[in-house]
């Protein structure tokens, strides 16, 4: 969490941002809140990106003002116009690109004063893994697949029964470049699995950590997966 305060001139206002990560090709949110004003027409929101000379987005007098928007953000940004009055200056970024990563500044002017806060935005690709029993294999084998990751993640297997065991000798992980030539499909195979055990396939890079669990018993197979972003720090 980054909390920024205004400078000189008018009074300062508190602006708060939260570091976040964007998934390439999907929509992302750059979070920013500020002390609200009672009049929408008095609020100016400017989003800027370090090293980019045009604006990322500008909202003033109750509407978007994009004449000075940088070409790299053309048609990809929006604020939540109906929430600006309550102090939400968050930016929706459509079709996140790898090059969107960097330091952003949320700069606010209201009748109460000015303020700004920076936000670190990481970009990459992350997806939920799915673990299945590979019935085509000669021995009991589990296959963990996740369709989109970038940068290349690490894959670690764990089991509930053999806690602390190192499965690197009995697993094989491959990374296959997807058609857009950036993200990769992750496939990891674990051999010699035993029934009545829960196995976890953990995929992690510097942006996200995802786990796919599978519980194999004689009568059923239970699956569960979850994904966690690693860098949500507020400012």
């Amino acid at each position: 969490l980054i909390i920024g305060f205004g400078i000189s001139g008018r009074h300062s206002i508190t602006v708060t941002t939260v570091a976040s990560a964007g998934n390439i090709g999907e929509d992302g949110i750059l979070s920013c809140t500020f002390e609200p004003d009672i009049k929408l027409s008095d609020i100016v929101i400017q989003w800027l990106k370090e090293g980019v000379l045009g604006l990322v987005h500008e909202f003033k007098e109750g509407k978007d003002e994009l004449s000075e928007q940088d070409e790299m953000f053309r048609g990809r940004t929006a604020v939540f116009a109906d929430q600006v009055i309550v102090g939400n200056a968050s930016l929706r970024l459509k079709n996140v690109q790898l090059t969107d990563a960097g330091t952003y500044k949320c700069y606010i002017i209201t009748s109460k004063g000015k303020g700004n806060a920076n936000l670190e935005y990481k970009t990459g690709a992350f997806s939920m893994p799915e673990v299945n029993v590979d019935y085509n294999a000669s021995s009991e084998t589990l296959r963990c697949e996740a369709p989109r990751w970038f940068p290349q993640p690490t894959v670690v297997w764990a089991s509930q029964v053999d806690q602390g065991a190192n499965f690197s000798e009995v697993s094989n992980t491959s990374f296959e470049l997807n058609s857009e030539n950036v993200t990769m499909k992750v496939v990891s195979v674990l051999y010699n699995v035993t029934i009545n055990n829960t196995y976890s396939c953990m995929i992690e890079n510097d942006i996200a950590k995802a786990t796919g669990d599978i519980k194999v018993t004689e009568s059923e197979i239970k699956r569960r997966s979850h994904l966690q972003l690693l860098n949500s720090k507020a400012s």
């Epitope: 090293g51 000379l53 045009g54 994009l66 004449s67 000075e68 928007q69 940088d70 070409e71 053309r74």
Partner: antibody, heavy 116, light 107 residues
Framework: QVQLVQSGAEVKKPGASVKVSCKAS????????MYWVRQAPGQGLEWMGR????????VYAQKLQGRVTMTRDTSTSTVYMELSSLRSEDTAVYYC?????????WGQGTLVTVSS | DIQMTQSPSSLSASVGDRVTITCQAS??????INWYQQKPGKAPKLLIY???RLQSGVPSRFSGSGSGTDFTLTISSLQPEDFATYYC?????????FGQGTKLEIK
């Protein structure tokens, strides 16, 4: 006031290279992109590319890719445009222009003549 | 690349006339269009930016309108110093292409 002053006219032989300079004054040099536009005799305006004076990052017109190089020197607030493997059709007035989404002001122009 | 089709390519008019030059973009460019005036031997000069905004110091007889793909530059009452070549330019997507120009001549 904001001013862009370009280097003088050049005469070059086909196959040679030319380097045109554009010195900026009257504003924060790193605050806006610098663009290059050329105009062949009696013809219209052709966008050549741009440079970000902060980072040095460039975007070039596809037809000039591989022949054009834009650089900058922040210590002297100067940008450079170098065009290599010159041919007769590169004979033109070359302009630098400052901006984000519109160009203002423009340099006075540099005439580059390519002739054997 | 986005194509900018400007018309007419040349135009004869008299002092005091109202003159309209049009520019059509090959795709939607919102209001990312600029208009420049160029006189012989001189660099182009910005007249209108963001489709309709008058650049500081430019006389109010110049105006711009339009959004999407169709745009217009209007000179409400031609003055002798207005005889020049006019260019539109899109700044929606690189390369920031120009129209082919409209030469405004004295009738």
């Amino acid at each position: 006031q904001v001013q862009l002053v370009q280097s003088g006219a050049e005469v070059k032989k086909p196959g040679a290279s030319v380097k045109v300079s554009c010195k900026a004054s009257g504003y924060t040099f790193t605050a806006q992109y610098m663009y290059w536009v050329r105009q062949a005799p009696g013809q219209g305006l052709e966008w050549m590319g741009r440079i970000n004076p902060t980072s040095g990052n460039t975007v070039y017109a596809q037809k000039l890719q591989g022949r054009v190089t834009m650089t900058r020197d922040t210590s002297t607030s100067t940008v450079y445009m170098e065009l290599s493997s010159l041919r007769s059709e590169d004979t033109a007035v070359y302009y630098c222009a400052r901006g984000i989404n519109w160009f203002d002001p423009w340099g006075q122009g540099t005439l580059v003549t390519v002739s054997s | 690349d986005i194509q900018m089709t400007q018309s007419p390519s040349s135009l004869s008019a008299s002092v005091g006339d109202r003159v309209t030059i049009t520019c059509q973009a090959s795709q939607d460019i919102s209001n990312y269009i600029n208009w420049y005036q160029q006189k012989p031997g001189k660099a182009p000069k910005l007249l209108i930016y963001a489709a309709s905004r008058l650049q500081s110091g430019v006389p109010s007889r110049f105006s711009g309108s339009g959004s999407g793909t169709d745009f217009t530059l209007t000179i409400s009452s031609l003055q002798p110093e207005d005889f020049a070549t006019y260019y539109c330019q899109q700044s929606y997507r690189s390369p920031f292409t120009f129209g082919q120009g409209t030469k405004l001549e004295i009738k």
